[in-house]
Interface confidence: low
């Protein structure tokens, strides 16, 4: 057993004319992710043949937005290694397929916008435990730089990870019953490797892959305590002097879940949480691979072709669950603004906007004065995507429905007296000033007349 590791160093336009400027389509920002597929041998294999040695998918990279007129740089990449665990021997000769995928982030109709941007295939010879191999590959107009290696996972060692050894604990001996692992004198043969997950505390094995339980423990991984027989009576506290709890005939007694499934009690029954690759009420159904199409709703399946090996479904937005089978209620995040109604169509979110609003999330206030009532003689004024009412004198508020005192703003200059009137306001100017707002001083040789207040006006306080 071991792990194949791939490190992507860079992905971007290759040298020469005709290089693409952006990996994103015209629809907006996108991000990249990578898929690696390993096939044994050097033979020409069909692209559809299974990734028999395993496959892995990277995380999504940072969002990339095209910069107009700028040359396309190396694109932002996801962090970390791509790791492909292999369970059996490392074959030494293999085919390495690296795919670069693009995920478009705009609102999509018809499913997640995933598209294959580039694929490189290399046939390689590689010994496990060796140094990182470096490579540069071109796929169309794109260039990919990467390194890779295969390493064994202890206790496996060797160029094919087939010998089970462990480092010697002392210079002179390996431990009771364990011989040095030839031809490497500083390694020792390992004891049998127990079944994966076998309890270190309550289980042991004499043959690789088995899990035998110590007394008092049961279950496929020796993690379930056997009901004690010293307590008699009903489920719950015993009436005996020992005062112990009697598990009684609980639904999870003896762990009914096969294949390493864990049991949890439900009212009157039990539920098994199965490891990946196993299904059924008791995790008894196995042998599901990517070839069976277990990923739904556009989920991307990654995993070995071996029926016993696990697969992983990478779900598109809006879906979750080990098989992308659960539809996420994305409307619970209330993405629609301004009172819009959210519709989760599975493949996309849609907002049904209230009248006067538009945009993917109802974020644009469209009210273009068409349906806007500015009361009391007000006029609607548009500008910058917004709108407002310009109210007639004497009125204010969003719709000009509120009465306003035209004299409140003290419009009469130089101590003029303000009078409110249905048609507006009138300024009675102080001596020496004239004009509609008393803004002009009277020339020394001129005569200024103080107009009488028109009938029906109420005098306001003189302005200070």
């Amino acid at each position: 057993a071991g792990v194949f590791e791939l490190q992507i160093h860079s992905f971007g336009p290759g040298p020469g004319p005709g290089a693409p400027r952006s990996p994103c389509s015209a629809r907006g920002p996108c991000r990249l992710f990578f898929r690696v597929c390993l096939k044994p041998g050097l033979s020409e294999e069909a692209a559809e043949s299974p990734c028999a040695l395993g496959a892995a998918l990277s995380a999504r990279g940072p969002v990339y937005t095209e910069q107009p007129e700028a040359p396309a740089p190396d694109l932002p990449l996801p962090n970390g290694l791509l790791q492909v665990p292999f369970r059996d021997a490392w074959p030494g000769t293999f085919s390495l397929i690296i795919e670069t995928w693009r995920e478009e982030l705009g609102d999509q109709i018809g499913g997640p916008a995933w598209s294959l941007l580039a694929r490189v295939t290399r046939r390689r010879r590689l010994a496990a435990g060796g140094p990182w191999a470096r490579d540069i590959q071109r796929a169309g107009a794109w260039e990919l730089r990467f390194s890779y290696r295969a390493r064994c996972e202890l206790p496996a060692v060797g160029t094919a990870c087939t010998r089970l050894c462990r480092p010697r604990s002392a210079p002179s001996r390996c431990g009771p019953g364990l011989r040095p692992c030839a031809p490497l004198e500083d390694e020792c043969e390992a004891p049998p490797v127990c079944r994966a997950g076998c309890s270190l505390e309550h289980g042991f094995c004499e043959q690789p892959g088995e899990c035998r339980c110590l007394e008092g423990w049961t279950g496929p991984l020796c993690m379930v305590p056997v009901s004690t027989s010293s307590c008699l009576g009903l489920r719950g506290p015993s009436s005996t002097t020992t005062g112990c709890l009697v598990p009684g005939p609980g639904p999870c007694d003896g762990n009914p879940c096969a294949n390493g499934g864990s049991c949890s009690e439900t009212p009157g029954s039990f539920e098994c949480t199965c490891p990946r690759g196993f299904y059924g009420l008791r995790c008894e159904v196995s042998g599901v691979t990517c070839a069976d199409g277990p990923c739904f709703n556009g989920g991307l399946c990654v995993g070995g072709a071996d029926p016993d090996s696990a697969y992983i479904c990478h779900c598109p937005p809006g879906f979750q669950g080990s098989n992308c089978e659960k539809r996420v209620d994305r409307c619970s995040l209330q993405p629609c603004r301004n009172g819009g109604l959210c519709l989760d169509l599975g493949h996309a979110l849609r907002c049904r906007c209230r009248a006067g609003f538009a945009g993917p999330r109802c974020e644009h206030d469209l009210d273009d004065c068409a349906g806007r009532a500015c009361a009391n003689g007000g006029t609607c004024v548009e500008g910058g995507g917004a709108h407002r009412c310009s109210c007639a004198l004497g009125f204010g508020g969003r719709n000009c429905r509120e009465r306003a005192d035209p004299c409140a703003a003290r419009p009469c200059a130089h101590g003029g007296r303000c009078y409110a009137h249905f048609s507006g306001l009138v300024c009675a100017c102080a001596p020496g000033y004239m004009g509609a707002r008393c803004e002009f001083p009277v020339h020394p040789d001129g005569v200024s007349a103080l107009p009488a207040a028109p009938p029906g006006l109420r005098p306001g306080d003189p302005q200070r």
Epitope: I109, G111, Y279, V285, D292, G318, E325, L345, G346, H347
Partner: antibody, heavy 122, light 107 residues
Amino acid sequence: QVQLVQSGAEVKKPGASVKVSCKASGYTFISYWITWVRQAPGQGLEWMGDIYPGSGSTTNYNEKFKSRVTMTRDTSTSTVYMELSSLRSEDTAVYYCARETTVGGAYAMDYWGQGTLVTVSS
Amino acid sequence: EIVLTQSPATLSLSPGERATLSCRASQSINNNLHWYQQKPGQAPRLLIKYVSQSISGIPARFSGSGSGTDFTLTISSLEPEDFAVYYCQQTNSWPLTFGGGTKLEIK
């Protein structure tokens, strides 16, 4: 080839429950949603809900039936069940199971069972 | 819920003629519309999915068109076995709903 085989006709009294089975074969059972549709005599089709066999707790029910319908599955026998409780005379119908074809999160039904007639009569 | 209205309720035509069946949705359902054929005593059969996508094993004389709220199923030249009831179905939002059906009968 893909086949969905349903259980036989049932006659029930009002207030009782009925459990209709739908056995799938010819494809990977856990990989497709199964939907239930009913058809009253001389009437159109009515969607009741669906279940994802890969995870038995993953179901969608029509609000109209939500309080009375339960969909379950048994992966060991590749069988889906639809149980309808508190039966009334208007539940008399042919009940169909159908396999959903998954495309982009919306579902058409490409394979159908032969139907199970449930008669509710006192 | 989305209501699908099919028209006409009954269509009387002769073999060899062209049939046009209509399905109108109460609100936009994008392209999430499918057509089924049902004969007496049989389960429905999927004819067209997602407005116009053909189904393996369905004769090429069946075709679909439309978008948004108005959709059409066309049978270019009727064969005797085409006389049946036709249903449209939307899978745009819950609950999934069917139209009331159009009965295509021999004239």
